[in-house]
Structures are given as C-alpha cells and as structure tokens.
C-alpha cells in the first residue's frame, strides 16, 4: 500500500517517499522506485537554508552601497548574506534593506535622546499635557498652550498630537 505520510527530511511524490535535498543543494530530479533523489549544490552567490525540494536556489542578498549598505557576513551555499549599514548609519528594519542617518519620532512622540554615531534616536510618547504634531529627529514634546495665562478658556482639548485650542471667555451679561 502506498504511503500517505513520510519521515522527516522526506517528501511524498508519485505515491512514494523521496529524500529532501540538504541545505545548500537544489532538486534536480525526484527519486523513483529505482533511483535516489538527485540534488546539485547551489551556484556561486546562491543559497538554500533548509532541507528542500526547490528546483532553484535563492540569490544572495545584494548589499547596495548606493543605499548605504555593506556586507556584514558573506553568504554561503546554506546562508544568505547579511547586510549592515555604513558606520554612523542605522538599518530601517531587522532585514536591513536600507539605511537612515537616524530615525525620526512620529507625531504623538517626542525625542528623548538625539542620535549619535552609535545609537539611534530614542523616542518617547508625549505624556498628558504635551504634544507633538510633527515627525522629527530633535524636537521634544511641546507643552499644551496655557489658555488661562492668556485670559482665555480651553475650547478644544489637546491630545498627544494636537495643542489645545483657546477661545474667549463667555462674558456674563
């Protein structure tokens, strides 16, 4: 009776279990009743990082110097290239696909610490009574306008992204 499931590092094809190709190799032909799975090593600048039945290896990541990237760790037949940014620059994501001089803090957040050559910008949420309505890499959260000191009243409450709106006091007749 043909198998319905195979062991680890095997795959089911044509009602039989074939060995997967090891990391660093791609599938050339499936096994048959009489032959083993045929695998071939990945070429230069290619890799496969799992036991697989892929017919094409993946291209190593290119660390584009025009984006400020450089190679941190050269890829092998089993691993992808790892990119990092030029000194003083920071990766925009864990995958490090591009670089920024420093990140900015979004509206609702202020800069707690300005970036240095080794550390990126540190942002903090604007607490009650403070706001930031811009993306910035240096501006702290600004305090809400004090309407009272201008002899005005709050017409619209402030948020972490907007200042309060002041207006004239209703005069009692």
């Amino acid at each position: 009776e043909p198998p319905t499931a195979c062991r680890e590092k095997q795959y089911l094809i044509n009602s039989q279990c074939c060995s997967l190709c090891q990391p660093g190799q791609k599938l050339v032909s499936d096994c048959t009743e009489f032959t083993e799975t045929e695998c071939l090593p990945c070429g230069e600048s290619e890799f496969l990082d799992t036991w697989n039945r892929e017919t094409h290896c993946h291209q190593h990541k290119y660390c584009d110097p025009n984006l400020g990237l450089r190679v941190q760790q050269k890829g092998t037949s089993e691993t992808d290239t790892i990119c990092t940014c030029e000194e003083g620059w920071h990766c925009t994501s864990e995958a490090c696909e591009s670089c920024v001089l420093h990140r900015s803090c979004s509206p609702g957040f202020g800069v707690k610490q300005i970036a240095t050559g080794v550390s990126d910008t540190i942002c903090e949420p604007c607490p009650v009574g403070f706001f930031s309505n811009v993306s910035s890499a240096f501006e702290k959260c600004h305090p809400w306008t004090s309407c009272e000191t201008k002899d005005l009243v709050v017409q619209q409450a402030g948020t972490n992204k907007t200042d309060v709106v002041c207006g004239p006091q209703d005069r009692l007749r």
């Epitope: 025009n66 984006l67 400020g68 030029e86 620059w89 925009t92 591009s98 670089c99 920024v100 001089l101 420093h102 990140r103 900015s104 811009v134 993306s135 910035s136 890499a137 240096f138 501006e139």
Partner: nanobody
Framework: EVQLLESGGGLVQPGGSLRLSCAAS???????EMWWVRQAPGKGLERVS?????????YYADSVKGRFTISRDNSKNTLYLQMNSLRAEDTAVYHC?????????WGQGTLVTVSS
C-alpha cells in the same frame, strides 16, 4: 530626484568665519526638517545642527553651541550654517540631510579646513 548641493567650504584660520549653504531640489523643501552633519577625517558622523520646517525650532550639538547658527530660506529652498569662532576641531566635510535621512537624501558635502 532629491538633490542637496552644499557649498561655502574652504580653508580658514582659527577664529575665522564661514557660511555654508545647501541648495535643495526635487522635494518640497518647506515641509522638511533639515540637518547639518559633519565627518572629520577618520572619524564618525557628528550631528551638528537641525532646524524644523518653519524655522522656529533649532538644535545644536554642545560642541558648536554659541558659535554656529542654522537658518533656512524656504522661498529660496536653501539651508544655511553660519560658522563663527572656528577651531581646528571643526575641520570636516559638512553634509546637509533631510528627513527621513535615507542614504540617497544625502549631499556630497563641502570641506571645511581650519588651519593656520
């Protein structure tokens, strides 16, 4: 395409002054926070000064506070850095940069050499 072209660098004696300019094109200059960043020979990047889009808020590194003044003219799409009381340690290539500070949004720089 974003272009940032710095100018105004040169050789100056200690105690002297220079005014750097950064001509911007390819984006709406008045909407962007702008920075001056410098790199001394063999050293890392140092964030020197920044200015918000309207020009009302500024930032200065401690090393230049009281000596450098950042400004902008949004009608001319130009960023400036007035540098007074220059010191040997101010020798560097000065770059202007725009938010979000990607590697592409980065000028080639202008060299400032402070030497007697």
């Amino acid at each position: 395409e974003v272009q940032l072209l710095e100018s105004g660098g040169g050789l100056v004696q200690p105690g002297g002054s220079l005014r750097l300019s950064c001509a911007a094109s390819g984006f709406t200059f008045r909407d962007y926070e702008m920075w001056w960043v410098r790199q001394a020979p063999g050293k890392g990047l140092e964030r020197v000064s920044a200015i918000n889009p309207a020009g009302g808020y500024t930032y200065y590194a401690d090393s230049v506070k009281g000596r450098f003044t950042i400004s902008r003219d949004n009608s001319k799409n130009t960023l400036y850095l007035q540098m007074n009381s220059l010191r040997a340690e101010d020798t560097a290539v000065y770059h202007c940069a725009k938010l979000p500070f990607t590697f592409e949004d980065w000028g080639q720089g202008t060299l400032v050499t402070v030497s007697s």
